[in-house]
Amino acid sequence: PALPEDGGSGAFPPGHFKDPKRLYCKNGGFFLRIHPDGRVDGVREKSDPHIKLQLQAEERGVVSIKGVCANRYLAMKEDGRLLASKCVTDECFFFERLESNNYNTYRSRKYTSWYVALKRTGQYKLGSKTGPGQKAILFLPMSAKS
């Protein structure tokens, strides 16, 4: 079952893959979606195959986020855009932190003050416009087993 208390990958050793997840954003109830063409957005459809994500621990507390169907990795670009790349680069790693409200945040390891975030409309939010305390940066990892 989809257990919201089942966190991400931060507590697991490097290289460890957990079951696929759906990342539910507190801001509007959108699931983070990675398209095969590299676009990133949010959708309120649990059945969308592109919301199934593989979180892999690179090191303790650092994860990459791969769209299972898209076979692409979430990346934060230097201008704050979110997109998904075919190959893992240094822009594809995020500090995963469990917040006190049981939601996770995903902060770019390269651009350390920028977070993965979704607007209330389901579009991604530019990293440069994100910050601590925003609802847009809060994600609840949920099981996405098929």
Epitope: P1, A2, G28, G29, R44, K46, S47, L140, M142, S146
Partner: antibody, heavy 121, light 107 residues
Framework: EVHLQQSGPELVKPGASVKMSCKAS????????INWVKQKPGQGLEWIGY????????KYNEKFKGKATLTSDKSSSTAYMELSSLTSEDSAVYYC??????????????WGQGTSVTVSS | SIVMTQTPKFLLVSAGDRVTMTCKAS??????VGWYQQKPGQSPKLLIY???NRYSGVPDRFTGSGYGTDFTFTISTVQAEDLAVYFC?????????FGGGTKLEIK
Amino acid sequence: EVHLQQSGPELVKPGASVKMSCKASGYTFTNYVINWVKQKPGQGLEWIGYNDPYNDVSKYNEKFKGKATLTSDKSSSTAYMELSSLTSEDSAVYYCAKEGGGKYVYAMDSWGQGTSVTVSS
Amino acid sequence: SIVMTQTPKFLLVSAGDRVTMTCKASQSVSSDVGWYQQKPGQSPKLLIYSGSNRYSGVPDRFTGSGYGTDFTFTISTVQAEDLAVYFCQQDYYSPWTFGGGTKLEIK
């Protein structure tokens, strides 16, 4: 405490339209979508669609497209459903229901008391 | 649309009995099934979400289980106040759909 107060019963003639309301209190209205559900007498439940009060965007069950129009008014924390070209098939109780959000995701955790619509000449 | 087939339609039980009802989805809906209770003359109330999680304040005699296409709802010890119709609902595929309901009657 979350409360959804729906408007009173309606007796309407075939071919007419009706607009019912659902006033929300006890939570931030724009944070959660409002679903609408139909229940014919002694029967099951049918999901009509939802309206997101944040941007007044609605999603519909295909079956109810052209029949139901969902809207909301942020200033009064009220959601509305208008039903058009009414027939006897539209006689039912209509519920508004707030989605749970968070760990409850899209489950409907608070319901209005229902608005009864009777279509009769 | 996903069809949720709920069985049985009626259950006649005595207080203290254990009752089980089932819901079968026409295709896999992951764990995204809720169970609602509707007492006579009242609105539905959420009891179980995401297949097996009890909603806040719901007594622990109510449990849900299942994954994929087959879901079960159990009341471990029926009480007189449990007289109601119980509905399952999937929110995995749009449009969200409900089962036809199981009417629980107490002898």
